[in-house]
């Protein structure tokens, strides 16, 4: 299979008014409760030295994270938005189970790890800039993605 | 079928620590799509949500009891933890093991009756 | 952080029907609660979760008789055809603060 061919989404899945509404609502709330504006998660340094045919895959990667390390553990939060946005998410991040790349993922891998070791770092309040940031998430995917 | 038991000292002095764990049978602790709470009932009354913890870590707990409880996990022996400090009399209660799923506590241990008495 | 509502106590007639009501607090009548059923003696059980559109999902082996609905800011859990084994405290739960609340409890006597 030619590199990349499975690293799509359908644009059908950024098209749904109330699903994209509760994705936004979601990061809305928990923008409201962290209190650490100086850090930004997904901005232009996660997308550094990373070709545009390879930003979908650098997005999986943060999903699978998003959803795994941040989410499911405060998946008890932010009534009644986290609930619904988790499925849709998921069913995203099933639709990218088979995307992979053939080339040199280093500069993915670290902007990856950076990313990650940033939220560790910021331990609770770190996951809660997460979830600020599905928004950021949500139109990076799509914008990589589709 | 998932199912919790919870195991406990049944009898603690006062201004001592309590500690409580519960153990999973029919599934895995390390489900990353849930939560593991503990919830506690004193003797004829209501209620009362003490904390939760992910098999990762994420931990959090009831303001009105945050200073006193810790919980914890043990993924190698498919079990987690709650020990609260300095108990009193108020403390005696039965206390409960939970699973949460999105939030909403869908399985329960069947209970450990703590009594906190010199 | 919500409050969840409910009436000390109910009862209905063997065979009959009960509607239980769980009210949330101003500013959470959007949130999912869970109810759950304590029998004399022993510890909770969970019996379903309903959303705000009233849908809801049980939990294993809970009986047809259980139906759980919503309006507004109110969750109700429906009993029909009461039995005698029905009789028990009905709590609901809510969550999504970064704590989890209870309501008080609802006792239901089940009637001749």
């Known amino acids: 299979l030619p590199v990349n061919t499975r690293c799509k989404l359908e644009v059908s899945n950024f098209q749904q008014p109330y699903i994209v509404n509760r994705t936004f609502m979601l990061a809305k709330e928990a923008s409201l409760a962290d209190n650490n504006t100086d850090v930004r998660l997904i901005g232009e340094k996660l997308f550094r030295g990373v070709s545009a045919k390879d930003q979908c895959y650098l997005m999986k990667q943060v999903l699978n994270f998003t959803l795994e390390d941040v989410l499911l553990p405060q998946s008890d939060r932010f009534q009644p938005y986290m609930q619904e946005v988790v499925p849709f998410l998921t069913k995203l991040s099933n639709q990218l189970s088979s995307c992979h790349i053939s080339g040199d993922d280093q500069n993915i891998q670290k902007n990856v790890r950076r990313l990650k070791e940033t939220v560790k770092k910021l331990g609770e309040s770190g996951e809660i800039k997460a979830i600020g940031e599905l928004d950021l998430l949500f139109m990076s995917l799509r914008n990589a993605c589709v | 079928q998932v199912q919790l038991h919870e195991s406990g000292p049944g009898l603690v002095k006062p201004s001592e620590t309590l500690s409580v764990t519960c153990s999973l049978s029919g599934g895995s602790i390390s489900s990353s799509s849930h939560l593991w709470a503990w919830i506690r009932q004193p003797p004829e009354k209501g209620l009362e949500y003490i904390g939760r913890i992910h098999y990762r870590g994420s931990v959090s707990y009831n303001p009105s009891l945050k200073s006193r409880a810790a919980i914890s996990v043990d993924t190698a022996k498919n079990q987690f933890s709650l020990t609260l400090s300095a108990v009193t009399a108020a403390d005696t209660s039965f206390y409960y093991c939970?699973?949460?799923?999105?939030?909403?506590?869908?399985?329960w241990g069947q209970g450990t009756l703590v009594i906190v008495s010199s | 952080q919500p409050v969840l509502t409910q009436s000390p106590s109910a009862s209905a007639s063997l065979g009959a029907s009960i509607k239980l009501t769980c009210t949330l607090s101003s500013g959470h009548s959007n949130y999912d609660i869970a109810w759950h059923q304590q029998q004399s003696g022993k510890g909770p059980r969970f019996l379903m979760r309903v959303n705000n559109g009233g849908s809801h999902n049980k939990g294993d082996g809970i009986p047809d008789r259980f139906s759980g609905s919503s309006s507004g800011a109110e969750r109700y859990l429906t009993i029909s055809s009461l039995q005698s084994e029905d009789e028990a405290d009905y709590y609901c739960?809510?969550?999504?603060?970064?704590?989890?609340?209870f309501g008080t409890g609802t006792k239901v006597t089940v009637l001749g």
């Open positions: 739960q809510t969550w999504g603060t970064g704590t989890h609340v």
């Open positions: 939970a699973r949460l799923d999105m939030g909403a506590i869908d399985k």
